[in-house]
């Protein structure tokens, strides 16, 4: 483990400071990590890392003269699971062919760069769950259709916060299993079109905090479990609650929006088919005490949870509960009540 220009320990190579003006061609091919920090690299040329079969991580950080990443830079690296490209304000261009065939990729960070367009991810084809972390790229204005198709065969988390995103096209997330989508702090983002999630499964978590989004899409919210829309002042109304089949947590801007969830009943069609198998809707209604938010069975039932009573053994009370317990904030209070404020004598 030795190199004339780059520091090294246990197959980790750190090429650091202004003396590094190009990727050294003689870096050992058995390296497991490469870090290029505070260098004067202007270009990362085609095939810079070819042959690094053991490579697991690449970091390219604080390179203030870096302008271009060429094709085939992150390509055919079977063990590469982490790429970090950050703090390169003059990086304006990442070749569409830069990322290819990275079956082990789990984390890709691109932050504080000058790029104007999302790189092409369609040839990455990871076999792992991927966290794509794209932040603080103020020149990225548009998320085009199919932007993330081919990124992973597994589910993905997309952190697209603090960019300059102004426009997201229909089918932008087509082909993805979207566990989480964070669009927060894109201050000029106004619209999520109705078909933005067309072809995607998810998102399960959606964050549009501190954007100018004024409406949520009418389609694609079926899997949404957590919605975050803090300081999203233009979001004055939510879609019909029957769009939120799976919602369990909402962090919103206006307390009045939480009122909608207070006494919300799921539609019959939204209950799982198993709910009709062991116990009837009427039985549930009978067991529901007035004012209760949850179905509660008698506490002294000795066989509950033990599986010996077939009446209850296959029954999932959360799944089949027609009342939805959504944790919502900010909670309504005396100054932001759910009722018409004229109903309060003291205020009237």
């Amino acid at each position: 483990c030795h190199h004339w220009l780059c520091h090294c320990s246990n197959r980790v190579f750190l090429c650091q400071d202004s003396k590094v003006t190009e990727i050294p061609p003689d870096l050992p091919r058995n390296a497991i990590e490469l870090r290029f920090v505070l260098t004067k690299l202007r270009v990362i040329p085609k095939g810079s890392f070819s042959g690094f079969g053991d490579l697991e991580k690449i970091e390219i950080s604080q390179n203030d003269v870096l302008e271009v990443i060429e094709a085939d830079v992150f390509s055919n690296l079977p063990n590469l699971h982490e790429i970090r490209i950050e703090k390169a304000n003059n990086l304006l261009y990442i070749n569409p062919e830069a990322f290819q065939n990275l079956p082990s990729l789990r984390y890709l960070l691109i932050s504080n760069t000058g790029i104007k367009h999302l790189p092409a991810f369609h040839k990455i084809q990871s076999l792992q769950k991927v966290l794509l972390d794209i932040q603080d790229n103020i020149n990225i204005h548009i998320i085009a259709r199919n932007s993330f198709m081919g990124l992973s065969f597994e589910s993905v988390i997309l952190w697209l916060n603090k960019n300059g995103i102004q426009e997201i096209h229909n089918c932008a997330f087509n082909g993805t299993q979207l566990d989480e989508l964070n669009l927060s702090d894109n201050n000029n983002l106004e619209e999520l079109p109705d078909d933005v999630f067309q072809g995607a499964s998810g998102p399960v978590v959606l964050d549009i905090s501190r954007t100018k989004v004024y409406s949520l899409p009418n389609h694609g919210l079926e899997n949404l479990k957590k919605l975050r829309a803090r300081s999203t002042y233009r979001l004055k109304k939510l879609p019909s609650l029957d769009k939120f089949v799976m919602l369990i947590e909402a962090s919103l801007t206006y307390p009045s929006h939480c009122c909608a969830f207070a006494n919300w009943r799921r539609q019959t069609s939204e209950l799982h088919p198993i709910c009709n198998k062991s116990i009837s809707r009427q039985d549930i209604d009978d067991m529901t005490q007035p004012g209760d938010q949850r179905v509660s069975l008698v506490d002294d039932e000795p066989s509950y949870g033990k599986g010996s009573d077939m009446l209850y053994s296959e029954f999932d009370y959360d799944l089949c509960n027609e009342f939805v317990d959504v944790t919502c904030s900010p909670k309504p209070d005396a100054f932001n009540p759910c009722e018409d404020i004229m109903g309060y004598n003291i205020l009237r």
């Epitope: 030795h2 246990n10 750190l14 003396k19």
Partner: antibody
Amino acid sequence: QVNLKESGPGILQPSQTLNLTCSFSGFSLSTSGMGVGWIRQPSGKGLDWLAHIWWDDDKRYNPALKSRLTISKDASSNQVFLKIASVVTADTATYYCVQINYGNYRFDNWGHGTTLTVSS
Amino acid sequence: DIVLTQSPASLAVSLGQRATISCRASESVDNYGISFLNWFQQKPGQPPKLLIYAASNQRSGVPARFSGSGSGTDFSLNIHPMEEDDTAMYFCQQSKEVPWTFGGGTKVEIK
């Protein structure tokens, strides 16, 4: 095979200027990644890094002595020089010339040292 | 400046046994995953000789009985099995930041 050899005056009086020369072979200071430095060791004591110079003429000094130190090189003749102004008795030590590899800042090869005594 | 404190100041070890020298830095000498900590051996009348660089990497030609470990602020040099020829002073040195500094040294001898 790398060799480094230090030469100096041996004895100086306080306030005089120390001029040290390191003559080396087996590598070139024109080669990227190469550097030469100076380290001193008072008799029976620890080691103090003084200064070094890289192939690209980039120089680094120990801040505690910076005002008195000057390092320079003549790559064509494979020599590095260190000047220490206004010596005092505390400068009495063995002075080593060292080949430094930029990768890991490794002190790869050392000269045998030259002894300086500062005495009035 | 980064201060390196070595302990013990001296150490007597039986032949074939393990000698362990500690080096503690006043602040971390790690940078982007690499520890800029080296170990030197110095015998009387000779210049120091590099044994270990970047905390745990053995310089070529150095016997395998010398090994280094640690990260951040705490490092150690192990000699095992101890041989007669290993009687010497051992110094740690950091090159994370200027001024590059050395530990005060540990004298190792045969018991």
